[in-house]
């Protein structure tokens, strides 16, 4: 049988006796887009009519009177079997049972879905004594229903080590469809099929589905949620959301912007961060990137000499973390750098150029054609050399480093001069005699000390010997030229 | 002026999922770079990963397999979801924003996570 | 990964004092270095960029230097409001990744 009550109701007997009712539902407004009717009703479905016996699970007592009389089996009696009501609105549902005196603390536990209630929840047991029976209602009270109350509620109580369970009590809790999945944002290549998904649940069963592009409806008749919109391809970003609809009324879901994946903007903002002889530093804002991400970046660089060929050289990097430190540069250069980043559409144009410039360097090479000989008259040696090739001073010469080292029966000392840079030859006192005198050069501009020429030897014999002969830098493949005078 | 806030459980299971939203106002996060920081107890700061102005994201490739960010501009909040933690996710999550000139100029406040079972 | 050693985790310093604060990257990483200051109970604040470049706002006290792999942070005239942890973070290469912390101890 159904029985349905408005929310106004009395509640009304559960069994003979003057015991309270079994339902009471308030009176909370609905929070959902109202039905035309002037109240929501609350449907009470019993499975069998009251007062008829249980045949769930009944506990039947071993003891007797004094007359030996077996007791009665225990059982909760009927009560209503399904509740039906709006979100937010308030409940009371209840349980009762009559138990002999003769039982002493009786307790009455509540279980919803097979879960022990326990705490924060109103529920009140009530004891009405008589003669020889007791009858107990426990009622179960919400004030204000959600969607994670429903399900089956049921009563438990212990006699003699024997379980008795009532039979269950379903609160359905409707109201406005409530999304379990919505659409995501997404971005898209042009002209791409692709599909969004949405999906809503009740109670009540079913729910709707309508899908709205840029305000407008895109499905004439609804689709049982869930629902897959498959958007054949876009050419402009476009808005979609879904609506769902059940009995209650509809719920919209958010609104997600589907975005069409484009080549990058070209980065802005290239920096100069740091500059070396040889290399430079740069930094970039990167530029919008189409809806997708960036693979890699390009770096390019032409000289910006304008007698330089124009070629340009290309250095490629990944696209974090927005920085490239630009290597093998030329001293004492000009160069434009420009850059450009890749997503999966395609590069993006060429960032405005910039001019960077390299500093002064070291020397790259030594100077060539050392050569050492040893005039006897001045007791000095001279050296003479050729300066290292403009392109490979990395900066203007400023002069030149000489290292001499005297080696003499086990005692070797090691003395550096400076010269300028005008000329390319210097001449240097003879520090001990009957000795091996080792000599370097090296150039040098302000940005350092470039690299030391190979050593050339002269051998300077004891006081009075007068043949002698230069010492150079030896050609290649020859180590260690010692001329012996 | 711009600011960070984060926001999100304090306790969180091992095994489970964390998630954590950052609420952005002062700025708009469909400009710029948006990212997470954390910082273990030991002191010692690990860069996450990050989303951009048109949602693209990067991750430390040593949470690549774990970690989603993910946004949503009508609430102007970005979020950060790290799959089965462990104890070693304890921490306290930074969200912060990148500047151009390459720093993160504003940062959170921190929320500090524990995972234990 | 680029990976930013902070050898000394405490340090300790009088109020007038200048204490300088180091930070050791495993590779290059060019001048592509910040430093943060973090309170106790705040998060962390920007005071140096690109290894040198001070952030607005921040007192001249406090000066950065280095390029490479070897970098240090520098407090002249330390304050009692400077008591903080001091972390460095490189940003030549993603990840970005930071240094272990030094906490500057007033005495």
């Known amino acids: 049988a159904i029985t349905e009550a408005r929310e106004e109701a009395k509640p009304y007997p559960l069994f003979p006796g003057p015991f309270p009712g079994s339902l009471q539902t308030d009176h909370t407004p609905l929070l959902s887009l109202p039905h035309a009717s002037g109240y929501q009703p609350a449907l009470m479905f019993s499975p069998t009519q009251p007062g008829r016996p249980h045949t769930g699970n009944v506990a039947i007592p071993q003891v007797t009177s004094v007359e030996s009389k077996p007791l009665p089996p225990l059982a909760f009696k009927h009560t209503v079997g399904h509740i039906i009501l709006s979100e937010h609105k308030g409940v009371k549902f209840n349980c009762s049972i009559s138990v002999p005196n003769i039982y002493q603390d009786t307790t009455i536990s509540w279980w919803k879905d097979g879960k022990e209630l326990l705490g924060a929840h109103h529920a009140i047991t009530q004891f009405y004594p008589d003669d020889e029976v007791t009858a107990i209602i426990a009622s179960f009270s919400i004030t204000s229903v959600q969607r994670s109350d429903n399900g089956s509620y049921i009563c438990k109580m212990k006699i003699n080590n024997e379980e008795i369970v009532s039979d269950p009590i379903y609160i359905e809790v409707q109201g406005l469809p409530h999304f379990t999945k919505q659409p995501e944002s997404m971005n898209v290549t042009r002209n791409t099929a692709f599909n969004l998904t949405c999906q809503a649940v009740g109670p009540p069963e079913p729910v709707n589905i309508f899908w709205v592009q840029n305000s407008s409806r895109v499905n004439e008749q609804p689709e049982k949620s869930p629902s897959v919109l498959t958007v054949p391809g876009l050419t402009e970003m476009a808005v979609f959301s879904c609506e769902a609809h059940n009995d209650k009324g509809l719920t919209v879901s958010k609104g997600v912007q589907i975005n069409i994946k484009a080549i990058p903007s070209p980065p802005t903002e290239v920096s100069i961060r740091n500059s070396t002889a040889h290399s430079i530093l740069i930094s970039w804002v990167p530029g919008f990137d189409g809806y997708s991400p960036f693979r890699n970046c390009s770096i390019q660089v032409k000289e910006a000499d304008p007698l330089s060929n124009g070629s340009v050289m290309i250095f490629n990097t990944s696209a974090l973390p927005h920085l490239y430190q630009i290597k093998q540069l030329q001293a004492l250069a000009n160069y434009s750098i420009g850059v450009s980043c890749m997503n999966e559409i395609g590069w993006s144009a060429v960032s405005p150029w910039i001019l960077a410039s390299t500093t002064e360097g070291a020397p790259s090479v030594a100077p060539l054609n050392v050569t050492v000989f040893l005039n006897e008259s001045s007791d000095n040696v001279d050296i003479r050399w050729m300066k290292p090739p403009t392109k490979q001073q990395d900066g203007e010469l400023v002069g030149y480093r000489i290292s001499h080292v005297w080696q003499s029966a086990g005692i070797s000392k090691e003395l550096l001069e400076e010269v300028g840079q005008n000329g390319s030859r210097a001449r240097i006192s003879v520090q001990v005699h009957n000795a091996t005198c080792t000599v370097r050069i090296a150039a040098v501009t302000r940005g350092g000390v470039g690299p030391f020429s190979d050593p050339v030897k002269i051998f300077i014999p004891a006081h009075g010997w007068v043949d002698y002969a230069p010492s150079s830098t030896p050609a290649p493949g020859n180590a260690d030229p010692v001329l012996i005078i | 002026e711009v600011q960070l806030q984060e926001s999100g459980p304090s306790l969180v299971k091992p095994s489970q999922t964390l998630s954590l939203t950052c609420s952005v106002t002062?700025?708009?996060?469909?400009?710029?770079?948006w990212n997470w920081i954390r910082k273990f107890p030991g002191n010692k700061l690990e860069y996450m990963g990050y989303?951009?102005?048109?949602?693209?994201?990067n991750y430390n490739p040593s949470l690549k397999s774990r970690i989603s960010i993910t946004r949503d501009t009508s609430k102007n909040q970005y979020y950060l979801q790290l799959n089965s933690v462990t104890t070693e996710d304890t921490a306290t999550y930074y969200c912060?924003?990148?500047?151009?000139?390459?720093?993160?100029?504003?940062w959170g406040q921190g929320t500090t996570l524990t995972v234990s079972s | 990964d680029s990976v930013m050693t902070q050898s000394h985790k405490f340090m300790s310093t009088l109020v007038g004092d200048r204490v300088s604060i180091t930070c050791k990257a495993s590779?290059?990483?060019?001048?592509?270095v910040a430093w943060y200051q973090q309170k106790p109970g705040q998060s962390p604040k920007v005071l140096i960029y690109?290894?040198?470049t001070r952030h607005t706002g921040v007192p001249d006290r406090f000066t950065g230097s280095g390029s490479g792999t070897d970098f240090t942070l520098t407090i002249t005239n330390v304050q009692s409001e400077d008591l903080a942890d001091y972390f460095c973070?490189?940003?030549?290469?993603?990840?970005?990744?930071f240094g272990g912390g030094t906490k500057l101890e007033i005495k």
């Open positions: 002062g700025d708009s996060i469909t400009s710029g770079y």
């Open positions: 690109w290894a040198s």
């Open positions: 590779q290059d990483v060019g001048t592509a």
């Open positions: 973070h490189q940003y030549s290469t993603y990840p970005y990744t």
């Open positions: 989303i951009n102005y048109s949602g693209s994201t």
């Open positions: 912060a924003r990148w500047n151009y000139l390459y720093y993160f100029d504003y």
